[in-house]
Interface confidence: low
């Protein structure tokens, strides 16, 4: 009998493992999962199990490769493939992701449901368990405050409009004796907007004033630090290749000095780099590393550390460019903390143009995504695109960040 009980436990564990991995690689999560998308590019879609077991929710289930492989080999979904040497898995190339058309987005929206009334200490597992017999669920998004506290409400995506409709239309649903408010996501937004109309202008104005004050402080600090950057400007000029771009400069100086700003447009024959430290040092290091001959795309380049009036003028221009860039972002109504209109090289840890794991690091960009994170799905370096902690927007706007928008 005990053996039978063990078998049942194992089967339950295997089902959970399959469900978790198939969620990670599923239609809902994968397009939003920056880290996994990066991994998939690296080795024909194969992701080492070594990396998979660092994902929090899988890690809690098992870290045993054999158990994972065994579980996936029994999966009915046939979404995943296991490599010959059983050390890697991938989403089967025969099951490509659906194209994200307007029609597809609309379909997802129509099977998304809002549920409110859970205790704020409920865990994702509690909610999953409660939803178990409520229809096929593809994604659960626990809504959170800015400080990551669960609000007691969730968004759920069902596999079909029919199952979502059936769920919404089931009367008297409770979670542990508590009545739940259940609405289609769209209806929830409509209701919320209606409630907000009264105090919207006032709240908006207050938020805007606070935001502007905060932003001004940030800008002032930034301007001040820029004005202190005497000796940090490096001019480059020459018969540059038309394809020369800022990325080339970033690569050239990647180990020699941190670039704060690059004033250069593709096709131009000259530009200016603003370093965090002294430009002379960065130039010296880069020259040493390149046997004294510092070229861009095999073209000779004249490098000159700016001084005096020329430097002041260049600094003034950079300050103006940054200001203009900030204003552009402000006019888009977006919270902005960057340093420029794409003229800035990728910063360490920004994830831009970089593989997001480095050797010994065991915390992955996906850890938060696959655990319980804020309602807007923004994790790591991606900043929150909204000012208020409880402000909702339609799904189409919400999912602008590339990071995951779900828990599971």
């Amino acid at each position: 009998m005990a053996e039978n009980g063990d078998n049942e436990k194992m089967a339950a564990l295997e089902a959970k493992i399959c469900h978790q991995i198939e969620y990670y690689f599923g239609d809902f999560n994968l397009p939003r999962d920056k880290f996994l998308k990066e991994q998939i590019k690296l080795d024909e879609g194969w992701v080492p199990l070594e990396i998979m077991i660092k994902f929090n929710r899988l890690n809690r289930l098992t870290t045993d490769f054999n158990v994972i492989v065994e579980a996936l080999s029994k999966s009915k979904a046939e979404l995943m493939e296991i490599s010959e040497d059983k050390t890697k898995i991938r989403r089967s190339p025969s099951k490509p992701l659906p194209e994200v058309t307007d029609e597809y987005k609309n379909d997802v929206k129509n099977r998304s449901v809002y549920i409110k009334g859970f205790p704020t200490d409920a865990t994702l597992d509690d909610i999953k368990e409660w939803l178990e017999d409520k229809g096929q669920v593809l994604n659960i998004q626990m809504r959170r405050t800015l400080h990551k506290a669960f609000k007691g409400s969730i968004f759920v995506v069902f596999d079909s409009i029919e199952s979502a409709k059936k769920f919404v239309e089931t009367p008297g649903q409770k979670y542990k004796e508590t009545d739940l408010l259940i609405l289609f996501k769209d209806d929830y937004f409509a209701k919320k907007n209606e409630e907000r109309k009264q105090n919207k202008v006032e709240a908006k104005l207050r938020a805007k004033q606070e935001q502007e004050a905060k932003q001004k402080l940030e800008e002032d600090a930034e301007m001040k630090s820029l004005e202190e950057k005497i000796g940090c400007l490096l001019k480059f000029s020459g018969d540059l290749d038309d394809q020369t771009c800022r990325e080339d400069l970033h690569i050239l100086f990647s180990n020699h000095g941190e670039i704060k700003w690059i004033d250069f447009v593709r096709g131009a024959k000259e530009g200016i780099i603003l370093f965090k430290e002294k430009a002379k040092e960065a130039l010296g290091k880069a020259k040493d590393a390149n046997n004294g001959n510092l070229q861009l795309r095999n073209k000779e380049v004249t490098w000159e550390v700016l001084e005096g009036e020329v430097e002041k003028e260049a600094l003034k221009k950079i300050i103006e460019d940054q200001q203009e860039s900030l204003n552009k972002w402000k006019s888009k109504g977006r919270r902005f903390k960057g340093k420029g209109k794409g003229n800035k090289a990728a910063q360490p840890g920004s994830g831009k143009g970089k593989v997001q794991f480095q050797g010994k690091k065991t915390k992955f960009a996906s850890d938060d995504e696959h655990d319980e994170h804020d309602e807007n799905g923004a994790t790591g370096p991606v900043k929150r695109a909204r000012e208020e902690t409880d402000k909702e927007e339609p799904a189409s706007k919400q999912q602008k960040t590339e990071n995951g928008a779900g828990d599971q």
Partner: antibody
Framework: QVKLEESGPELVKPGAPVKISCKTS????????IYWVKQRPGQGLEWIGY????????AYNQKFKDKATLTADNPSNTAYMQLSSLTSEDSAVYLC????????????WGQGTTLTVSS | QIVLTQSPAIMSASPGEKVTMTCSAS?????MYWYQQKSGTSPKRWIY???KLASGVPARFSGSGSGTSYSLTISSMEAEDAATYYC????????FGTGTKLEVK
Amino acid sequence: QVKLEESGPELVKPGAPVKISCKTSGYTFTNYYIYWVKQRPGQGLEWIGYIYPGNGGTAYNQKFKDKATLTADNPSNTAYMQLSSLTSEDSAVYLCARRGALGYYFDYWGQGTTLTVSS
Amino acid sequence: QIVLTQSPAIMSASPGEKVTMTCSASSSVSYMYWYQQKSGTSPKRWIYDTSKLASGVPARFSGSGSGTSYSLTISSMEAEDAATYYCQQWSSNPQFGTGTKLEVK
């Protein structure tokens, strides 16, 4: 367009090392794997190893682990393969190839470098 | 590791003739890839994902198969098709077949 250009033919004495280059153009070097493949006269193709210039990661076919060392110079968009302690068995054409970004194949190849090991 | 065996090793065909060469895997694989290599040149991607033709490959070529058995077919041989064809699979690492040399009669 995408191009992979390998260095010229090499005649090397046994025991010496050799370094072959594969200069790429027409695409973002750091976004694609470069693989090296060995082909002996009248024989098939044998995978040696790869480098991913994006993070410097490398992997080798066990058979070539102590023979080949792969490096990349990102500013010049060039991949290199150094072969050590050469013997006549190493005489072959060495090809570099770019692996498709999400494909399971090699989409572009270098023209090959002929290595002759002889005293 | 998987071993890919191509047969025949050498074959010849007259222009207009139908040609089929096979690639047998020692254990099941998901996809097969084919390359064409002419004497003194590097290989060219020819067929990918078992049956898709790479750009510039004439429509007379086709690929098929599954599991352990795959094939490349030329519906009507032309002189320019004379070359060595290699199959290749990719599980954790690339593995090439032994090659089939196709000559024109």
